[in-house]
Interface confidence: medium
């Protein structure tokens, strides 16, 4: 069975200046994803993100999540690239705290 | 049945630039990344950069000013491009498949092209 | 750069016996971005061992993974003469994705 990510992108204040933006996948089967920040559309190096672990969310699926450190105002410039079961989608960072999309296959 | 065939010259001249063709099969490129990879008796294994599926490029800062990698999903084919070779990139350069999932594990390589750079 | 030393850089086993090798990461990865790869001679590598402790397709249950942060092992619990072979870590936690040095198998 495929069950396609909920991508969810939220923000939050990490210093003056700065904004920590956090991409999270829940509720995907199987656990096979890749998830990743890009800035005007170019991968973002590793050493800039980070990774939390692929982990069961307790229903048969599973969630997992990257984060980046970036500059308050720049945030267009940002956008969460997930591959999942041959498939791809590109999730901007929200205007506002929280923005919540379902991938259609 | 998965593969990867590279085709590509043997011998470079100092300076010049070398052009590798990595020909997939048993898989498309629309849906699985692909890294390149090289090996030398000097530095050991070293990771060039990679394609993912949608053509946006990562690159190994090392070799960012002269490597550019692309492809042609239509004809199955990728291509790594480096200029300004010196000796010491003389090795055996693999294009390899990204494993989906397997956390950018490289699931499936191909020959190697044998490189030799000198005049 | 993320160092990865592997050690012994040679380890000779007898048929049988039990091994461990090391790879030893000059700063944390995540076990989710650590695999090993067995090079045979005029071969291409292959994947061996995915994400710390799982086995790629068709490789061996002798064969076994383990660690966590900086520490990391392979072990095979019952030497064959198909395992003879270069075995190579990997980190892909921070870009430049890197490899170790590789430890060589033999047989004793």
């Known amino acids: 069975r495929r069950v396609p990510p909920m991508v969810n992108v939220t923000r939050s204040e990490a210093s003056e200046g700065n904004i920590t933006v956090t991409c999270r996948a829940s509720s995907f089967y199987p656990r096979n994803i890749t998830l990743t920040w890009r800035q005007d559309g170019v991968s973002l190096s590793h050493d800039t993100q980070q990774w939390g672990d692929v982990l069961p969310d307790g229903n048969g699926t599973y969630q997992t999540w990257v984060a980046t450190r970036i500059c308050q105002g720049e945030e267009q410039r940002f956008t969460c690239y997930m591959e999942h079961s041959g498939n791809h989608s590109t999730h901007p960072v929200p205007s506002g705290k929280v923005l919540v999309l379902q991938s259609h296959w | 049945q998965v593969q990867l065939k590279q085709s590509g010259p043997g011998l470079v001249q100092p300076s010049q630039s070398l052009s590798i063709t990595c020909i997939v099969s048993g898989f498309s490129l629309t849906t699985y990344g692909v890294h390149w990879v090289r090996q030398s008796p000097g530095k050991g294994l070293e990771w060039l950069g990679m394609i993912w599926t949608d053509g946006t490029t990562d690159y190994n800062a090392a070799f960012i000013s002269r490597l550019s990698i692309n492809k042609d999903n239509s004809k199955s084919q990728v291509f790594l491009k480096m200029n300004s070779l010196q000796a010491d990139d003389t090795g055996i350069y693999y294009c390899?498949?990204?494993?989906?999932?397997?956390?950018?594990?490289?699931?499936?390589w191909g020959q190697g092209t044998s490189v030799t750079v000198s005049s | 750069q993320i160092l990865l030393t592997q050690s012994p850089a040679i380890l000779s086993a007898s048929l049988g016996e039990r091994v461990t090798m090391t790879c030893t990461a000059s700063s944390s990865v995540s076990s989710s971005y650590l695999h090993w790869y067995q090079q045979k001679p005029g071969s291409s590598p292959k994947l061996w061992i995915y994400?710390?402790?799982n086995l790629a397709s068709g490789v061996p249950a002798r064969f076994s993974g383990g660690g966590s942060g900086t520490s990391y092992s392979l072990t095979v619990s019952n030497m064959e003469a198909e395992d003879a072979a270069t075995y190579y870590c990997?980190?892909?936690?921070?870009?430049?994705?890197?490899f170790g040095s590789g430890t060589k198998l033999e047989i004793k």
């Open positions: 390899v498949r990204k494993g989906h999932g397997y956390y950018y594990a490289m699931d499936y």
């Open positions: 990997h980190q892909y936690h921070r870009s430049p994705f890197t």
């Open positions: 994400s710390t402790s």
